[in-house]
Amino acid sequence: KVAHLTGKPNSRSMPLEWEDTYGIVLLSGVKYKKGGLVINETGLYFVYSKVYFRGQSCTNLPLSHKVYMRNSKYPQDLVMMEGKMMSYCTTGQMWAHSSYLGAVFNLTSADHLYVNVSELSLVNFEESQTFFGLYKL
Amino acid sequence: KVAHLTGKPNSRSMPLEWEDTYGIVLLSGVKYKKGGLVINETGLYFVYSKVYFRGQSCTNLPLSHKVYMRNSKYPQDLVMMEGKMMSYCTTGQMWAHSSYLGAVFNLTSADHLYVNVSELSLVNFEESQTFFGLYKL
Amino acid sequence: KVAHLTGKPNSRSMPLEWEDTYGIVLLSGVKYKKGGLVINETGLYFVYSKVYFRGQSCTNLPLSHKVYMRNSKYPQDLVMMEGKMMSYCTTGQMWAHSSYLGAVFNLTSADHLYVNVSELSLVNFEESQTFFGLYKL
């Protein structure tokens, strides 16, 4: 069970949406639904995501990148991994930085995994730069 | 099938060359050839790399770190993962930053994987800081 | 064999201490002892760690994040992976940055793995932000 989804430029809202068909995408034994990877077998998974933020005139808006889990059994989303950046570039400069997250989690059938960012307009969606994936150990 | 190669200070050109023998290096079921990891069994692999950039006097040269794939069957290199940094330090200051990449890919026998950076002179090759590896899922 | 430990706010000295019981923690087939993950079966492991540094007023203190190994058979600690940051924020500003490390190592029964940081007071220990884990391939 494995997935590697890449950035989808027409993401307009949270959670991020992903390319699940073309390019270097992988999707096997896991479903993709409305931005989420849907687990269908309980077990241990390594989950990872990278987001590439960039801008033209740095104002140092705080950036956050989260991988979170939702399951209808639970009232609240669970933030599994998170990266935050503040004061990361020189005012007015063209800038670029990435956030990488990756770790092991015990996931349950019907868990939905999503990625959220704080500033959608500052994300670049190139397939090599922004991605989301997992594999069952 | 697994590899963990570490920085080789006498890298002079692209792609980066790697230490494949001494220290905390691993190489089993995968070949190393002229900077590249050569896949000899088709399948799913987790591929990762970290590059440690540093300098004495920051000029904010754009930095890039790419893991790419080459196969004689295809006319062009495929960039699998990429990290870019711009406006990451204060002009004139001593600086240091890392780029980390890691994801799952479906690789084919005879694929060659390489790492490229934009500014070779700004890479520090300590074995704990700059590395390149993979393992078959 | 798998572990995912999360930040423990009452870490007071090095190596970092970790939450090994509550929350999104995993610990199976590996022991946790005084900040360390203790290997009890020789083999290949993917080891990872993320540390979230942040501060109220940037002074650009050099930051380092190390995963290292100790075994009573060897006289010295072995630094397996390391991230360093210098000149990463604007003087006087509130700032936040993460360091991520992850790679494959051949570990031996009785190896103890630890995480070290240079500036403990600048680490934020939220479970989603600062963590340490591994799994046997």
């Epitope: 801008g55 033209q56 005139s57 740095c58 140092n60 063209m94 307009s121 | - | 500003q93």
Partner: antibody, heavy 119, light 111 residues
Framework: QVQLVQSGAEVKKPGASVKVSCKGS????????IHWVRQAPGQGLEWMGV????????SYNQKFKGRVTMTVDKSTSTAYMELSSLRSEDTAVYYC????????????WGQGTLVTVSS | EIVMTQSPATLSVSPGERATLSCKAS??????????MNWYQQKPGQAPRLLIY???NLESGIPARFSGSGSGTEFTLTISSLQSEDFAVYYC?????????FGQGTKLEIK
């Protein structure tokens, strides 16, 4: 609608200082940097510097360093540009303009403030 | 700093005709597949108005008779069929790095 409204014209003596304000409305002020550009009579446009409306720090054109100070008041969505040690050649129209971090250019400009330096 | 040079300084064209304005940068303003070159129009007593960004993209609300082209160091602004309201001064400006710099302007006048 998006607006950048600048303070009124000023007449200053050589050696004095002037402080020009630029109030943003119709958008989220802290999402955009504010750039300052000046234009001497009959001349072209000259970039002076930029301020982060979120963080409050600035980057200046070397030519004006030491004489220019840019500040911001987030509570009133107002940016300020102060130029000190004025000389006659500082006589110009001073413009503020906003720059979206995700875009390529200054998309909205203030109406301009004429600063005249004369003894 | 990057120096921008516009030519000609003045261009006399009749209404309805085509106008071609040139801008040269002292070094490339390209990065990562984009050209960081913008064009502004300024009429007397008014603030500059953005026409073209990233060399060839038309700003929202700008008539389609305006177009931009070029990459690297050489750029062109073209007005396909001049209207009376187009007679103004045009500035190119790069946003590749700080300090941003403008060309000295091209005055487009009625022939």
């Amino acid at each position: 609608q998006v607006q950048l409204v600048q303070s009124g014209a000023e007449v200053k003596k050589p050696g004095a200082s002037v402080k020009v304000s630029c109030k943003g409305s119709g958008y989220t002020f802290t999402d955009y940097t504010i750039h300052w550009v000046r234009q001497a009579p009959g001349q072209g446009l000259e970039w002076m510097g930029v301020i982060s409306t979120y963080q409050g720090d600035a980057s200046y054109n070397q030519k004006f360093k030491g004489r220019v100070t840019m500040t911001v008041d987030k509570s009133t969505s107002t940016a300020y540009m102060e130029l000190s040690s004025l000389r006659s050649e500082d006589t110009a129209v001073y413009y503020c303009a906003r720059f979206p971090d995700w875009d390529y250019a200054m998309d909205y400009w203030g109406q301009g403030t004429l600063v005249t330096v004369s003894s | 700093e990057i120096v921008m040079t516009q030519s000609p300084a003045t261009l006399s064209v009749s209404p309805g005709e085509r106008a071609t304005l040139s801008c040269k940068a002292s070094q490339s303003v390209d990065y990562d597949g984009d050209s960081y070159m913008n064009w502004y129009q300024q009429k007397p007593g008014q603030a500059p108005r953005l026409l073209i960004y990233a060399a060839s993209n038309l700003e929202s609300g700008i008539p389609a008779r305006f177009s931009g082209s070029g990459s690297g160091t050489e750029f062109t602004l073209t007005i396909s069929s001049l209207q009376s309201e187009d007679f103004a001064v045009y500035y190119c400006q790069h946003s590749r790095e700080l300090p941003y710099t403008f060309g000295q302007g091209t005055k487009l006048e009625i022939k």
